[in-house]
């Protein structure tokens, strides 16, 4: 029987009455066009909803937008369009919400053709009031907040000017012209690329990378011959054109661009690309595209300096620059990532790593599941997960995989069981141990979300027909109850819950269609009365993450330490609550060779954990050097994996070698590092 259908499933008592008392409908008094929703702040209950409606007329498009505000997690909405003078808001810029609990909101308005500049509406009180401000430029991008100070904003203009405001958009100053891309770094630093001759496109590969640490008073050129740049964790990356040909290479800096090192990664040609898949303060996952239009490349993982890279996964699916990749950070368990590979026969298979890219394996076949038509052997197959690529291919996959840091171990995803991803209608699978084991959670495609740090999972069937039923589970997806939230079914468009999965409210969005009109409608359901008591100590049990073999002394050790968590028992129906903090206890493991990566000039032979000196350096290894000039590279062949906390045990000591190489990069010559003032 399907999950939740057997009679022994744990029932939640009187849930219909409890939910009926906590279901709130709001019908929006405007025509169905598009709707966008933003949460303002954390645990504030404030939601802004912007509805827009376009009527194409003969010469132009007539547009109308309305702004609504809720301060009770979506149970009630108030039309506040008059606060923005009934102005039409440009949806492509969305609602720029300030970082953390700043309460700041910027809306970008549509202005008539001949105006000198754009117009914004600013709020710094969680959208209770707005101030209209006319801009001295037409914005090309959404306003970007400095992560450190929400009063500092930057934006690019349609004429490629870089504009900065120091007073939350009240006054703007153009600090540089001919800017292609700008990003906030740490400590209110701005990094940006500039062109000298024609345009961003024409000068691609000849751009300069600049930095200002004082909001435009002074500048420093920190790179030339730049193709693009990116920030990830504490690393600043730039792809730089080679002198001799049209290839480019990655250079990395960990001091905001003062000094650079060439990364030990293959160079790429014009049609190829690099992509930072994930980064933290310890390391980076880098995708390097394969030559030709293959749709795949190689994942490399970095050392702690971002310089030395180990090959992590071949044939990694990544369609084009800015295209689709299924690479997913499983945020509910440290070290876990899921992605897809394109196999030789062009089928797509899911791979998972539990140790931050050290080893990749197939996902274990869910218990009590049968292999589908893609499987050669009906008894041996794997689970394959649908993610961004499947969604882009318009498969029947309404949602990407879901995990939340405070819902430890839980991963929910659409998938199929076979030798490869299937185009058949997928089912929804859940893992409660961070991806080691899986079970079918729901039959057919669904929308799903996690509430109360995993205490409740909510799902809605993906259907082309109108719906009026929501499903929920209080035991991590084992048993499901269904609740009819309205008599009149609606055309469902989305589930919305407060980011962070701490809320107990869920909003179901959709529209009703009648003979002449269709209207937006939302239903907000509060589950607080289902979880009627606060969880106590007895409601939690102890769980060891990454456990695979209790008889192994180092069971659970990943990156040099193991972690035990207090997790809610599946049978406990109680509230974790908004202030819930994951309780975990780490313990350090003994070091083994697995805790070390091979440093530059060394490699691991197949099925060996020892690092062996490379007999000769070829290709990109030969070009690699430190700080862009001839350098003594001293190594004993091993380097601790970034973030690894092991102590004692194996300490791989090999003879220290000096690896001298002729540097091939003149990416940065000292004369280029001149400071400029505005």
């Amino acid at each position: 029987s399907a999950p939740g259908e057997d009679e022994e499933c744990g029932r939640v008592r009187d849930f219909v009455a409890k939910l009926a008392n906590n279901t709130h409908q709001h019908v929006f008094d405007d025509l169905r066009g598009s709707v966008s929703l933003s949460w303002v702040g954390d645990s504030t209950g404030v939601i802004l909803v912007l509805t827009t409606f376009h009527v194409p007329l003969v010469i132009m498009t007539f547009g109308q937008s309305k702004l609504y505000r809720s301060e009770d997690y979506g149970k009630n909405f108030k039309d506040i369009t008059d606060l923005i003078n009934n102005t039409f808001i440009r949806t492509e810029f969305g609602m720029a919400i300030g970082p953390e609990n700043s309460g700041k909101v910027v809306l970008t308005a549509e202005v008539s053709g001949g105006s000198r500049g754009g117009r914004i509406f600013r709020s710094s009180d969680f959208a209770k009031n707005f101030v209209q401000t006319d801009l001295p430029f037409h914005p090309l991008t959404q306003m970007m907040y400095s992560p450190q100070n929400s009063d500092y904003l930057l934006a690019l203009s349609t004429e490629n000017g870089l504009w900065v405001s120091k007073n939350f958009g009240g006054k703007w100053e153009e600090i540089h012209k001919a800017v292609c891309l700008a990003k906030w770094g740490s400590d209110n630093t701005i990094f940006f690329t500039t062109y000298a001759n024609g345009s961003c496109k024409a000068d691609l590969g000849a751009l300069e990378l600049w930095r200002t640490s004082d909001l435009g008073k002074s500048f420093k050129t920190i790179g030339v011959k730049i193709y693009s740049f990116g920030l990830g964790g504490r690393f600043l990356f730039a792809s730089v054109m080679a002198d001799k040909d049209t290839t480019r290479r990655i250079h990395v800096s960990t001091d905001q661009g003062d000094t650079w090192s060439m990364a030990q990664l293959p160079s790429v040609g014009q049609e190829q690309f690099y992509s930072i898949l994930a980064a933290n303060d310890d390391m980076v996952f880098m995708h390097v595209d394969e030559p030709g239009d293959t749709g795949f490349g190689t994942i490399f993982t970095s050392d702690d300096r971002g310089i030395v890279y180990s090959k992590s996964l071949d044939r990694h699916l990544y369609t084009t620059t800015g295209g689709e990749t299924d690479f997913t950070n499983v945020t509910s368990l440290r070290g876990v990532y899921i992605t897809s590979v394109l196999s030789e026969d062009n089928s797509i298979q899911t791979m998972i790593t539990f140790d931050q890219g050290g080893r990749w394996t197939h996902l274990r076949k869910p218990e009590n599941s049968e292999c589908d038509a893609t499987a050669k052997n009906k008894n041996e197959c794997s689970l394959h997960i649908h993610a961004s690529y499947s969604i882009s291919q318009k498969l029947n996959v309404p949602m990407a995989p879901l995990s939340e840091p405070n819902a430890v171990g839980i991963v929910i995803a659409h998938g199929s069981v076979g030798d490869a991803i299937s185009v058949m209608v997928p089912d929804v699978y859940i893992s409660d141990d961070g991806g080691y084991s899986w079970t079918k959670m729901l039959e057919g495609p669904h929308y799903y979300t996690i509430l109360d740090s995993g205490g409740i999972i909510v799902a809605i069937e993906h259907s082309s027909r109108p719906i009026n039923v929501i499903k929920f589970s209080t035991d991590e997806g084992q048993c499901w109850q269904t609740y009819t939230f309205t008599r009149d079914p609606i055309y469902f468009t989305g589930l919305a819950s407060e980011p962070g999965a701490r809320s107990m409210n869920i909003s179901i969005w959709g529209f009703t269609e009648s003979f002449l009109t269709s209207q937006w409608v939302s239903y907000t359901i509060d589950f607080k009365d289902i979880l009627e008591r606060n969880c106590e100590e007895k409601d939690y049990t102890i769980w060891l993450a990454h456990s695979t073999d209790p008889e192994d002394y180092e069971d659970g050790c990943i990156l040099g330490y193991k972690e035990q968590f207090l997790r809610l028992r599946k049978s406990s129906v109680c509230q974790n609550g908004r202030d819930y903090v994951v309780t975990k206890q780490p313990s350090i493991c003994l070091c083994s060779l697995e805790d070390f990566l091979c440093d530059f000039g060394a490699y691991r032979p197949e099925n060996d954990s020892k690092c062996v000196e490379q007999p000769e350096l070829k290709g990109h290894d030969l070009e690699f050097c430190l700080y862009g000039r001839e350098e003594h590279l001293t190594t004993n062949g091993y380097r601790k994996i970034p973030g690894d906390k092991c102590q004692g045990g194996v300490n791989p000591v090999r003879e220290v070698k000096d690896l001298k190489k002729k540097c091939t990069s003149n990416f940065l010559s000292p004369e280029k590092q001149n400071s400029k003032s505005n």
Partner: antibody, heavy 124, light 106 residues
């Protein structure tokens, strides 16, 4: 093969404390929870609490909260159960048992290895 | 805490009989139930874990079933060595045992 060997029988006065030890051999002691279960004469089994040696995470049945302390010494692969404020109804055989484990959950798979039991008699 | 109710408390049977013992939990415990056999003066012995998984070394005449709140231990053909007391134990809340079922010779 894993074995749990418990300390010998004890006779105690009401109001005093008793500390029973349980030494493991032949397995990875640190990776399994050790539970303490008691059985009064002619009665059923009663769980008192348990401990995970790695990290020393202990939890107790509500009935014994505040009166029982369970500890573990990883270096000697030994678990201890101390029961204070003894009364005559604490007269029982006290067992330590290893919680079997197939996944990361410590207490979910039953107790697969048991000690031989320690008889504690509380009498004035 | 979760209460476990075992029935019957005593059961008289003969060698070769099919014996069924039931255990009811006061709330759903999914499949987190174990069954033990105990003989006088001895420590209990694990027979079944996770409601239906047979512990290694236990004869296949023992089987367990159920999930949620209702569970059953079945001995398909009672052997002389099987006369003992049987306990169920839930593991999803703080551990609790059933009151026990004594299987005696008819």
């Amino acid at each position: 093969q894993v074995q749990l060997v418990q300390s010998g029988a004890e006779v105690k006065k009401p109001g005093s404390s008793v500390k029973v030890s349980c030494k493991a051999s032949g397995g990875t002691f640190r990776n399994y929870a050790i539970s303490w279960v008691r059985q009064a004469p002619g009665q059923g089994l009663e769980w008192m609490g348990g401990i995970i040696p790695i990290g020393g995470w202990a939890n107790y049945a509500q009935k014994f909260q505040g009166r029982v302390t369970i500890t573990a010494d990883e270096s000697t692969s030994t678990a201890y159960m101390e029961l204070s404020s003894l009364r005559s109804e604490d007269t029982a055989v006290y067992y330590c048992a290893r919680q079997g484990r197939k996944t990361g959950y410590y207490y979910y798979y039953g107790m697969d290895v048991w000690g031989q039991g320690t008889t504690v008699t509380v009498s004035s | 805490d979760i209460q476990m109710t075992q029935s019957p408390s005593t059961l008289s049977a003969s060698v070769g009989d099919r014996v069924t013992i039931t255990c009811r939990a006061s709330q759903s415990i999914s499949s987190w139930l174990a069954w033990y056999q105990q003989k006088p003066g001895k420590a209990p012995k694990l027979l079944i874990y996770k409601a239906s998984s047979l512990e290694s070394g236990v004869p296949s005449r023992f089987s367990g079933s159920g999930s949620g709140t209702e569970f059953t231990l079945t001995i398909s053909s009672l052997q002389p060595d099987d006369f003992a007391t049987y306990y169920c134990q839930q593991a999803d809340g703080h551990i609790t045992f059933g009151g026990g079922t004594k299987v005696e010779i008819k």
